[in-house]
């Protein structure tokens, strides 16, 4: 015969326990039913009646099979940093979430305590943990050839355009302005290697511009830590780099020949020596043994003629460990010095070893003073490279980076006045470098 | 320069365990986190975790939670990275690496041979 | 934890052609949120973070070096081979609070 179901209440078997939504009342001794979620017990059951439930109140909730007198309180409206992920009815409690930007800073069995904003990190720091429901930002300083100019609690720092031609170098807080061409996120496949001695790892650089008036600094992020790309010169590499030697034959050619035919027609010679320094580079203590990379303009006047030379090179920057105080919540620390590098400079990728400088000037000076003699501007262009260990040379050594020489006394022999007149003949331009040597 | 040298080959019977240093120079260590990452013999790359060396929080992968533990002294501008109850399928070639998806700067140690036999 | 499988395990190219490297999450999409590594190893030398961020070359890594995502896959794609870019390459998804590395891709010469 098939076991008798019992139904409830009823008195359990002795060493049995009730059954599946029941639950032992230990004043009646019964074994009795539970409310179904959304119900309490109005009336506890007796030998003789079961359990009377009754629906929740409204703001008041039970999950679960149970027989408590009184349903729970919803938690209380979820504040204005916090979203409701689900509302508050008969069966479920309302659960609070953080809202987008903000983290769980103290959470509770289900949902959140306590919002907290999202970190942010300020300009020339990325995102290097993005945040999660219940952890916050982590910002760290963008590596040298990277850049972050937003104060974002999601972006990550990301590499500097690559420029033909570079307008203004790229620093931590701010990508490279290339002038007027098209940039490009990386290194084109063609390169050009100029004729320098190259180092172990090879540079990709992009094709020799246009002939400009202007002074010109090619910009480029040396090579990551990684073994060189060999083989990836492009076709064109060769013609190119023949075009600009030729090119830089002719014009120290033209400029010989002027000056030998000023010499003949005995206008007294003056051989200005002017000289564009620039100190090596101390290593940057703050940041270890060797800061980010410099680069250093030189930069003419105003007048594309002018043979006023200045060096602009901005200090190494000096930077302090970033979440060491400190700090309101959605803020990055600000122990940091605010921008890495100053206009002169720019971050350059890890691998460049040593500082590297190219600099291209080009300096129209020579005239005499009836204006009828004038010196070829000639573009001259000069890498510098203090290899990998800076300590080599002496801190304060100065390396001098242009020479021009063969200019023309004048009445005065201001740098002002050396500036003869430029309109009888055009005079020939420099080609500006391609790019820095390789490294 | 910026180089991670690591600590030479380690010989280890099963259940020991080993401790593996990185030495970074020619950056600031707290800049960067330090990643783990090995290699077994033919095999692929496997990210073990990381830890930041400005404040020592770490992350590391699910498979070894509870069994490796990652440090910095920043006064000596090195990591560790502790692997216990070494196992026979351990045996692999250790990197450090302040490699990140987030930071591109992009330096790995020269590798540190750990081999578990008994 | 999330499984990230990558395909092909070998592709046999010639130099100049153009290869393409896929790295699929096995929980689904992968999105902005992973930001998609792309690691280069060759034998004896260091590793090389070749793409960031999902489509972002690292500094110094050539143009023809390129990441991109859809739906549940990310690509490297390289757009015509040479031949220092045989080599072994690792793609590597962020999850909330790890990384995962895909098994690799070895490209090899055909």
């Known amino acids: 015969l098939p076991a008798q179901v019992a139904f409830t209440p009823y008195a359990p078997e002795p060493g049995s326990t009730c059954r599946l939504r029941e639950y032992y009342d230990q004043t009646a001794q019964m074994c009795c039913s539970k409310c179904s979620p959304g119900q309490h017990a109005k009336v506890f059951c007796t030998k003789t009646s079961d359990t009377v439930c009754d629906s929740c109140e409204d703001s008041t909730y039970t999950q679960l099979w149970n027989w408590v007198p009184e349903c729970l309180s919803c938690g209380s409206r979820c504040s204005s940093d916090q979203v409701e992920t689900q509302a508050c009815t008969r069966e479920q409690n309302r659960i609070c979430t953080c809202r987008p930007g903000w983290y769980c800073a103290l959470s509770k069995q289900e949902g959140c305590r306590l919002c907290a904003p999202l970190r942010k990190c300020r300009p020339g720091f990325g995102v290097a943990r993005p945040g999660t429901e219940t952890s916050d930002v982590v910002c760290k300083p963008c590596a040298p050839g990277t850049f972050s100019n937003t104060t974002s609690s999601t972006d990550i720092c990301r590499p500097h355009q690559i420029c033909n031609v570079v307008a203004i170098p790229g620093n931590a807080s701010m990508d490279a302005v290339c002038t007027s061409t098209s940039p490009t996120r990386s290194m084109a496949p063609g390169a050009v290697h100029l004729p320098q001695p190259v180092s172990t790892r090879s540079q990709h650089t992009q094709p020799t511009p246009e002939p400009s008036t202007a002074p010109s600094t090619s910009f480029l992020l040396p090579m990551g830590p990684s073994p060189p790309a060999e083989g990836s010169t492009g076709d064109f590499a060769l013609p190119v780099g023949l075009i600009v030697g030729v090119t830089a034959l002719g014009l120290l050619i033209i400029g010989v020949v002027n000056c030998v035919i000023m010499t003949q027609v005995k206008k007294k010679p003056l051989c200005l020596q002017r000289e564009a320094k620039v100190p090596h580079l101390p290593a940057d203590k703050a940041r270890g043994t060797q800061g980010p990379e410099q680069q250093h303009l030189l930069i003419t006047a105003p007048s594309s003629s002018s043979s006023s030379l200045e060096s602009s090179a901005s200090a190494l920057d000096r930077r302090a460990p970033t979440r060491n105080q400190p700090q309101a919540p959605g803020v990055e620390a600000s122990g940091a010095g605010e921008a890495r590098a100053s206009t002169g400079s720019s971050d350059s990728s890890p691998g460049g070893h040593g500082t590297q400088v190219n600099v291209t000037c080009i300096v129209n000076v020579c005239s005499s003073s009836d204006h009828s003699s004038q010196c070829s501007s000639q573009a001259s262009s000069t890498m510098g490279d203090t290899d990998s260990s800076p300590s080599e040379s002496p801190k304060d050594e100065q390396v001098p980076f242009s020479k021009e020489e063969c200019a023309f006394r004048s009445q005065l022999e201001t740098p002002e006045t050396l500036l003869g007149s430029t309109e009888e003949k055009p005079l020939p331009l420099g080609v500006p470098d391609a790019g820095m040597k390789p490294s | 320069q910026v180089q991670l040298v690591q600590s030479g080959a380690e010989v280890k019977k099963p259940g020991a365990s080993v401790k593996v240093s990185c030495k970074a120079s020619?950056?600031?260590?707290?800049?960067?986190?330090i990643h783990w990452v090995r290699q077994a013999p033919g095999k692929g790359l496997e990210w073990m975790g990381r830890v930041d060396p400005e404040d020592g929080n770490t992350e590391y992968a699910q498979k070894f939670q509870g069994r490796v533990t990652m440090t910095t002294d920043t006064s000596t501008d090195t990591a560790y990275m502790e692997l216990s109850s070494l196992r026979s399928e351990d045996t692999a070639v250790y990197y450090c690496?302040?490699?990140?998806?987030?930071?591109?700067?992009?330096?790995w140690g020269q590798g540190t041979t750990v081999t578990v036999s008994s | 934890e999330a499984v990230v499988t990558q395909s092909p395990a070998t592709l046999s190219l010639s130099p100049g052609e153009r290869a393409t490297l896929s790295c699929r999450s096995s929980t689904g999409p992968v999105t902005t949120n992973n930001y998609a590594n792309w690691v280069q190893q060759k034998p004896g030398q260091a590793f090389r973070g070749l793409i960031g961020g999902t489509n972002d070359r690292a500094p110094g890594i050539p143009a023809r070096f390129s990441g991109s995502g859809s739906g549940t896959d990310t690509t490297l794609t390289i757009s015509s081979l040479q031949p220092e870019d045989f080599a072994v390459y690792y793609c590597a998804l962020w999850y909330r609070n790890h990384w995962v590395f895909g098994g690799g891709t070895k490209l090899e010469i055909k």
């Open positions: 690496s302040t490699w990140d998806g987030f930071s591109y700067f992009d330096y």
């Open positions: 020619g950056y600031t260590i707290t800049d960067f986190y």
